[in-house]
Interface confidence: medium
Amino acid sequence: KSSSEATNITPKHNMKAFLDELKAENIKKFLHNFTQIPHLAGTEQNFQLAKQIQSQWKEFGLDSVELTHYDVLLSYPNKTHPNYISIINEDGNEIFNTSLFEPPPAGYENVSDIVPPFSAFSPQGMPEGDLVYVNYARTEDFFKLERDMKINCSGKIVIARYGKVFRGNKVKNAQLAGATGVILYSDPADYFAPGVKSYPDGWNLPGGGVQRGNILNLNGAGDPLTPGYPANEYAYRRGIAEAVGLPSIPVHPIGYYDAQKLLEKMGGSASPDSSWRGSLKVPYNVGPGFTGNFSTQKVKMHIHSTSEVTRIYNVIGTLRGAVEPDRYVILGGHRDSWVFGGIDPQSGAAVVHEIVRSFGTLKKEGWRPRRTILFASWDAEEFGLLGSTEWAEENSRLLQERGVAYINADSSIEGNYTLRVDCTPLMYSLVYNLTKELESPDEGFEGKSLYESWTKKSPSPEFSGMPRISKLGSGNDFEVFFQRLGIASGRARYTKNWETNKFSSYPLYHSVYETYELVEKFYDPMFKYHLTVAQVRGGMVFELANSVVLPFDCRDYAVVLRKYADKIYNISMKHPQEMKTYSVSFDSLFSAVKNFTEIASKFSERLRDFDKSNPILLRMMNDQLMFLERAFIDPLGLPDRPFYRHVIYAPSSHNKYAGESFPGIYDALFDIESKVDPSQAWGEVKRQISIATFTVQAAAETLSEVA
């Protein structure tokens, strides 16, 4: 392997030594330690955990470990004035109120500072009105309501089920539809897997369980008051009215017992089809308002949360590279949790901790990586990826010049079925090669490779005998590194069987029931899946930091660029008449992709054949590989999304969690048939095609022979 050629002090200090040092029992111990009390961003408990991690990383042997703090906008419920939703009668009397907190799990009854369920950054307000059920509150759900069913949400409180898309997109869609408030709930159809018991007897969501979460639409901005710049002591802060991404209407989450009470009385229009019906024993009528006998009753929200500038703390650990200390490979994951964080994030943080310990053990024996490895424990991820984004804003000049790769390390598990990887195409071959060397933890695959079980359980839709790797979207701390700075990024975790478990996320996501016991009893009793994820994440970091030649294959980018060009062309071709009328052509884009493919192929030949012992040549070739991802960055950003600058990938405008390819062209084409000025709309499509063409061609040229 290429890593064996690297700067190992002795032959035993190789990838195998690093992987062999990783222990499931340690991950288990670390997870238990990290999950005994809540670690909400901005609280004393999370500051204390930051200091503990700093201390332990120093003990493990890192060269330096620093706390970096920022003062960012966070949001909390009012402790003396709880949030809730009522059904009120014609006299204004509250005849039903939603719960004020989740019933705590056994053994945690006396834990203080469990934040009650709330939608972070909701404005205060007490809207009152008729209810409209809007399914998942996706773009297409509002199209169905407004265009097909002619239902007007203006002045109404909408109730939407969690799932399918990021909750912030739901709120944005409701605002655009004119709603005065949003109620989010977890439907058993999405958060209760058939045949599994509710927590504490299984891993399903009980009726009193509620998903917390932020409802921002930051589009990569970081702290809402300091977009583009670190939220330090001399930062200029916007007023709340000018803050980025804050919702304008009150929002509150509830569980399915409470949702039953709101939905069972719904009248008005019937649901359009079965895709709008969940698993509660209610009619799933759309409304507006309650049926017959209850038509005089209304819904009232009581939201009193406050947003306040609060100090957060990242932990940044450094393991200096022996040969290229100015080249950074970053492993980062967040530390803050909504409550106990049994899965999110501490199943990831425990893995990072064990990876640091293993690297530290090798370092204590005299080894150093070729390149510098940075380890990060991010704060305030749950409040909008704030810790990672502020740190990257503060260090952007260093990162754009020195950043080789970023590996994300949030939740290690969201199931225990198979591996899930999302990454830049540059890392495909790294991931394939690594997983071929690792042992599968799956039952029935004893003695087989992880690659084999992964390929069997999650096959690529395009290439036979290969596993699926997905596009990077957002909703996690890689966002600023990949979408803003253009640093090659990847993430890996164990996941569920998407064929049989179609619920969104895992049922207990962001609830009080996400405990150590949930993981230890139901998901990974032997911590073998955690160990496998540690091996994948740690192995990727080891190779990226230690390989003489960076383990990036630019030919894989060429393959996906062709696939994405075909896809966007086919979308456009749904409008053949308009393409003809407005002279819309994709020829230039396909030409640029062809050029990229040819140049990438030639570059790969030179990479194979060049003299690896020549340090200048080696550095030159590695820089071309490192800067390829950077070449896809447009400094002007995407339309109305200046911090999403990657031209090939961006978070979907309709679902932050999902990645979209050629997002500029995609958004220009989206719903184009409804645009009032088709000439202008198709002009924008042409502009976006030209930007994509230029970017692909410019990126290709960075791989050409230098002189």
């Epitope: 809730y84 719960s99 019933p103 705590p104 009854e109 009980p206 009726g207 009193g208 017992y257 009470k261």
Partner: nanobody, 127 residues
């Protein structure tokens, strides 16, 4: 051991007040709705009041509405029933009972069932 222990019963004149308490142990009190139920001499069981696990919802039988108030203190694992304007027909053994559904929020029309009972405390309203 799962236990509910009522206290506070006694003899009281019509129109006066009494406060019943129920101490819970052996289960996650803060996760369950709680009820008061009564049984008058020679009669069947009558449901009196319900409070949700977090205290946000309280429901009462029509016969006690406006006179009785159910409350709970999750930190102390206690359930209370404040009985005002007592009448002769309120004479009964009062039981506190745990709802079987963890975190369930009952509506006024629901049929109530219980999985853990106390031993009861006698309330006699007589002049």
């Amino acid at each position: 051991e799962v236990q509910l222990v009522e206290s506070g019963g006694g003899v009281v004149q019509p129109g006066r007040s009494l406060r019943l308490s129920c101490a819970a142990s052996g289960f996650t009190f803060s996760g369950y709705g709680m009820h008061w139920v009564r049984q008058a001499p020679g009669k069947g069981l009558e449901w009196v009041a319900y409070i949700s696990y977090d205290g946000s919802n309280r429901y009462y039988a029509d016969s006690v509405k406006g006179r009785f108030t159910i409350s709970r203190d999750n930190s102390k694992k206690t359930l209370s029933l404040q009985m005002n304007s007592l009448r002769a027909e309120d004479t009964a053994v009062y039981y506190c009972a745990k709802d079987p559904a963890w975190g369930l929020r009952l509506g006024e029309s629901s049929s109530y069932d219980f999985d853990i009972w106390g031993q009861g405390t006698m309330v006699t309203v007589s002049s």
